[in-house]
Amino acid sequence: IVLRPSRVHNSEENTMRALTLKDILNGTFSYKTFFPNWISGQEYLHQSADNNIVLYNIETGQSYTILSNRTMKSVNASNYGLSPDRQFVYLESDYSKLWRYSYTATYYIYDLSNGEFVRGNELPRPIQYLCWSPVGSKLAYVYQNNIYLKQRPGDPPFQITFNGRENKIFNGIPDWVYEEEMLATKYALWWSPNGKFLAYAEFNDTDIPVIAYSYYGDEQYPRTINIPYPKAGAKNPVVRIFIIDTTYPAYVGPQEVPVPAMIASSDYYFSWLTWVTDERVCLQWLKRVQNVSVLSICDFREDWQTWDCPKTQEHIEESRTGWAGGFFVSTPVFSYDAISYYKIFSDKDGYKHIHYIKDTVENAIQITSGKWEAINIFRVTQDSLFYSSNEFEEYPGRRNIYRISIGSYPPSKKCVTCHLRKERCQYYTASFSDYAKYYALVCYGPGIPISTLHDGRTDQEIKILEENKELENALKNIQLPKEEIKKLEVDEITLWYKMILPPQFDRSKKYPLLIQVYGGPCSQSVRSVFAVNWISYLASKEGMVIALVDGRGTAFQGDKLLYAVYRKLGVYEVEDQITAVRKFIEMGFIDEKRIAIWGWSYGGYVSSLALASGTGLFKCGIAVAPVSSWEYYASVYTERFMGLPTKDDNLEHYKNSTVMARAEYFRNVDYLLIHGTADDNVHFQNSAQIAKALVNAQVDFQAMWYSDQNHGLSGLSTNHLYTHMTHFLKQCFSLSD
């Protein structure tokens, strides 16, 4: 059980207040984290509160401003990047968001040696992506879907690609589906470790069907937004990987890296690129039917002036029970011999663990094992491997950082974080300096987040980087809800849940219950993290019990649970939410006439199906930006879990798992359907089809659209959304306003 430290004493009770919706919408109780921007083994940059860019040297204890807030303000810079030779800084301004990760911006180069902006051969605007080489001060950037290279910031650019075209050919940046569902980055170019080579992806979207939607704006006529977006079963982007020698870019030009024959024989994806050395690169490929992944190690052949990917350096990863990997196929972390690597994949018992691959995957040496999962490999040094897992005390929703000594035999394991601030901190991530000389730990909860700096050799804490003192003080007079994380054992399935209870919770009383669900494959909602958010307010002020349940299909508890939903989305996720609700009712403090469910995105899909399950459990529910049919969602994501919507594959379940097919079942629930009209991700089409099916079935429901808003419903829409949902729930639960 994780109970927030209670500060409620009778004498203080009159000074304590509940959370308000305004607190949440204003972000009154938001927290800060501190991630050092490492620039060496012992130095990092950080943007101070007054916007100066400050360089800190851990070993000397000195710090100095390398860039003043005055310089930042002179171009309205919101971000910066120091060149590795420390001669230049790029300043980023005019940020303009595109999709989840992508944005365009204007870039200015500031010369630190003379304190002036670089004049002559200025960068064009707006730029889609820009980055320094890892050594020196070469620049690579993407402008109008083409890649350019500068040997020095003041030099004229060398144009690497010429075929870039909006919505057709993307060089060095991903198209929509690769950005959202495969790379999870705004870039698709990678410098080799010393900047000799630049690798990049070219995405050809020429034959991809286009999603078109209206953007209303303020003009007389709405604009139409067109995005090449492959839905399930549609034509996919064609990807090619090229590498260019940046020292002599015109010599042989970009050289294409060959695709492994077993991958190239049918539709495929490129999933990631990892440089090993300046002359060795590792590419990962994935069949369109995403249960086969190939890791290919390629070497530069100076005699060929191109890249050789011998079959002997191809490593196949295949899943027989589901899809390859977790959400994504894991990426390798290479060791110092530049050929062997560490990688997380399923062991024979179906748990994701670290393996060491020296020659073949079949001969892999398992490094971690147990009925828990290794989650991320942070760093491999010559004598240590740092990783995170949820092993400690068998709580899947925790993250601790471990060190394995790989320099000694047998390797010894040490938990770096387990006992540091045990009550406050059970969910960590880490950020390492070069050679792991130092590292920062960022604790996300369950207590108030704290960021600390540590010695990479001894693990000793050096200093607190951010402890959120102001937040701690601000919360002193707030009646926060209590939180507990527990598990239910049902039919050989373990259902972990988080329950958020009103501050004066009394087990002998009855409370309305709100289920918050996401439930997507390889997700996790039950985590030991701190949050003061909308559901905290609902518990604190409105006296609701809120529960989050990780059912089948969720992550970090083994493949049996994860892959249970393979090829049948929308079945077990819903069943498990319903099962959990029945168990909560049995606990005796839930008013079974006042149970609601809500979710966003995949959670909107699950909440809709739960409401339409015909169980009579739910009085009402909300779906925000839900998927309504898997035929409407992106190919890369959908097909990973569902296969293809073809007769000889899985069309039947595509048809059976729609929300529309269950329209009749909404008759006995109050349903609030919400969607942004400019949702590039889960298209408004999804909600439009739900609404049409409900109208055709003559079922009453409530709806709200947000004009020109995307999948995030940000800005003023957020305030409107949560206010609207609050009213809906209070009405449903007969709570006075």
């Epitope: 190239a264 100076e302 005699d303 002036q305």
Partner: antibody
Framework: QVQLVQSGAEVKKPGASVKVSCKAS????????IHWVRQAPGQGLEWMGW????????KYAQKLQGRVTMTTDTSTSTAYMELRSLRSDDTAVYYC?????????????WGQGTLVTVSS | EIVLTQSPGTLSLSPGERATLSCRAS??????????MHWYQQKPGQAPRLLIY???NLESGIPDRFSGSGSGTDFTLTISRLEPEDFAVYYC?????????FGQGTKLEIK
């Protein structure tokens, strides 16, 4: 036109060293790899290794590793091949050859050859 | 290392005839994009001369009666109509893997 001109014939005793030169002209010397290939009397061709004058990269045949050294002097556009601890079976015609621009390992121009005789 | 076996060892033909020389590699010397096999001609007392690179590409200045074909492990050099100056020793060479290796040669002699 491209030309590779090699140094003259050498007679060496077993255990000695030999250094053969190869002067390039008619192209940018730093752009192309120079290979060294030898041919024993009445026998086939044997690849010894290559050097890239521009990058300084070198690749030797495993068999000769430790006995052979390839160098270049970009100021004179000359490549050198030194073979140490000579044995009688090192008697051969030694060729330098330019790596073809498009050949990916093909050798498009060859020197006239240097006969090295190892005899006691 | 990759062993290249040329056949026949000696080929006796008359001018005007068609010559077919074979080279077999102990393992594939091709990738999906390129075959790393090249052919040379060598006359007595002379350095070898490049004829064909990449299995089938004719080197500039080489008469088009010479052609190359094949991929993977089996390659062929064809001389469509033999001229008197074509009688020489022919070598195949692979650059797929280190060390580069040459075949033992096919001697093309006048019948």
């Amino acid at each position: 036109q491209v030309q590779l001109v090699q140094s003259g014939a050498e007679v060496k005793k077993p255990g000695a060293s030999v250094k053969v030169s190869c002067k390039a002209s008619g192209y940018t010397f730093t752009e192309n790899i120079i290979h060294w290939v030898r041919q024993a009397p009445g026998q086939g061709l044997e690849w010894m290794g290559w050097i890239h004058p521009g990058s300084g990269s070198i690749k030797y045949a495993q068999k000769l590793q430790g006995r052979v050294t390839m160098t270049t002097d970009t100021s004179t556009s000359t490549a050198y091949m030194e073979l140490r601890s000579l044995r009688s079976d090192d008697t051969a015609v030694y060729y330098c050859a330019r790596h073809g621009g498009t050949g990916r390992g093909a050798m498009d121009y060859w020197g006239q050859g240097t006969l090295v005789t190892v005899s006691s | 290392e990759i062993v290249l076996t040329q056949s026949p060892g000696t080929l006796s033909l008359s001018p005007g005839e068609r010559a077919t020389l074979s080279c077999r590699a102990s393992q594939s010397v091709s990738t999906s994009a390129y075959s790393y096999m090249h052919w040379y001609q060598q006359k007595p007392g002379q350095a070898p001369r490049l004829l064909i690179y990449g299995a089938s590409n004719l080197e500039s200045g080489i008469p088009d009666r010479f052609s190359g074909s094949g991929s993977g492990t089996d390659f062929t050099l064809t001389i469509s109509r033999l001229e008197p100056e074509d009688f020489a020793v022919y070598y195949c060479q692979q650059s797929r893997e280190y060390p580069y290796t040459f075949g033992q040669g096919t001697k093309l002699e006048i019948k």
